[in-house]
């Protein structure tokens, strides 16, 4: 039969979890459309394009788990959704929050 091919629609990027320093966060990426089903590649948009060393990526589900986030985890992240006939991207800005010093009276 005839197979209809559809490029990935613009994916949606979002953060799950607290952005406080030391927390674990999950970066989520998904396209509503795409035949065959897209795979997802996350990269950090700095000079290395590498994810932090504490990150694990699932290219099928479109998730990245970053454990024990630090100030070095902050920055722009890009998800590229791709299949046989096209690619589409979304961006996410992760800003890790440092704890505010408490005044001791």
């Amino acid at each position: 039969g005839l197979t209809v091919l559809v490029p990935p629609s613009a994916p949606h990027c979002q953060i799950q979890g607290s952005q406080d320093i030391g927390s674990d966060v999950i970066l989520l990426c998904s396209s509503e459309e795409g035949i065959p089903r897209p795979t997802y590649l996350w990269e950090k948009l700095d000079n290395t394009l590498k994810l932090p060393p504490t990150a694990t990526q699932d290219q099928v589900q479109g998730t990245v788990t970053i454990r024990n986030i630090s100030a070095l985890s902050s920055g722009l992240y890009q998800c590229v959704a791709s299949n046989a006939i096209g690619t589409s991207t979304c961006l996410l800005d992760l800003q890790v929050i440092s704890p505010q010093p408490r005044n001791i009276g």
């Epitope: 613009a10 700095d46 000079n47 920055g75 722009l76």
Partner: antibody, heavy 119, light 108 residues
Framework: EVQLLESGGGLVQPGGSLRLSCAAS????????MSWVRQAPGKGLEWVSA????????YYADSVKGRFTISRDNSKNTLYLQMNSLRAEDTAVYYC????????????WGQGTLVTVSS | DIQMTQSPSSLSASVGDRVTITCRAS??????LNWYQQKPGKAPKLLIY???SLQSGVPSRFSGSGSGTDFTLTISSLQPEDFATYYC??????????FGQGTKVEIK
């Protein structure tokens, strides 16, 4: 297809008011921060104002603070700029633009609407 | 506010030339630097985001580099449709959002 269409520009006297609109289509409007950027004749780009996707946070350039008000109606997919106490130096083409992420790069722009402040 | 300074303000070049435009930030902006192209009477168009990432649909002759305070936009082989004004923009501490003053690329 993402489209942004500005309207409401025109000729106004110094001290007068004008309301610009930007009709958005082709994307989930409430998910994106939006900005107004202007360009005076023969000059460079100047950011004017920004608003969060929900409309709960607004930001202004010092040059327009207290005179301009940015707002949005997510049910109508429309962005607004209310301009009061207009000055000659506000004369410019006003663009609405979509922030791709947070308040980062502008990935889509409208065609612009010209505001002329002159007596 | 972060100030963005572009150089040169204008340049003359021929088709096929390699063109380099620089942008300097008044303080470190990491990789939060974007480049736009604007032609007369038209809205700006995003070329490069995050200092070096090419926007979809933009020809590969355009490239960006740099981080911190110093950034470069390079056109490897200038084409007739590339004659335009180019702007850098920082999105590190934004809002406020700041642009460079622009670089006009003219035909020699």
């Amino acid at each position: 297809e993402v489209q942004l269409l500005e309207s409401g520009g025109g000729l106004v006297q110094p001290g007068g008011s004008l309301r610009l609109s930007c009709a958005a289509s082709g994307f989930t409007f409430s998910s994106y921060a939006m900005s107004w950027v202007r360009q005076a004749p023969g000059k460079g780009l100047e950011w004017v104002s920004a608003i969060s996707g929900s409309g709960g946070s607004t930001y202004y350039a010092d040059s327009v603070k207290g005179r301009f008000t940015i707002s949005r109606d997510n049910s109508k997919n429309t962005l607004y700029l209310q301009m009061n106490s207009l000055r000659a130096e506000d004369t410019a083409v006003y663009y609405c633009a979509r922030h791709w992420v947070s308040y980062g790069p502008f990935d889509y722009w409208g065609q612009g609407t010209l505001v002329t402040v002159s007596s | 506010d972060i100030q963005m300074t572009q150089s040169p303000s204008s340049l003359s070049a021929s088709v096929g030339d390699r063109v380099t435009i620089t942008c300097r930030a008044s303080q470190s902006i990491s990789s939060y630097l974007n480049w736009y192209q604007q032609k007369p009477g038209k809205a700006p168009k995003l070329l490069i985001y995050a200092a070096s990432s090419l926007q979809s649909g933009v020809p590969s002759r355009f490239s960006g580099s740099g981080s911190g305070t110093d950034f470069t936009l390079t056109i490897s082989s200038l084409q007739p449709e590339d004659f335009a004004t180019y702007y850098c923009q920082q999105s590190h501490q934004s809002p406020p959002i700041t642009f460079g003053q622009g670089t006009k690329v003219e035909i020699k």
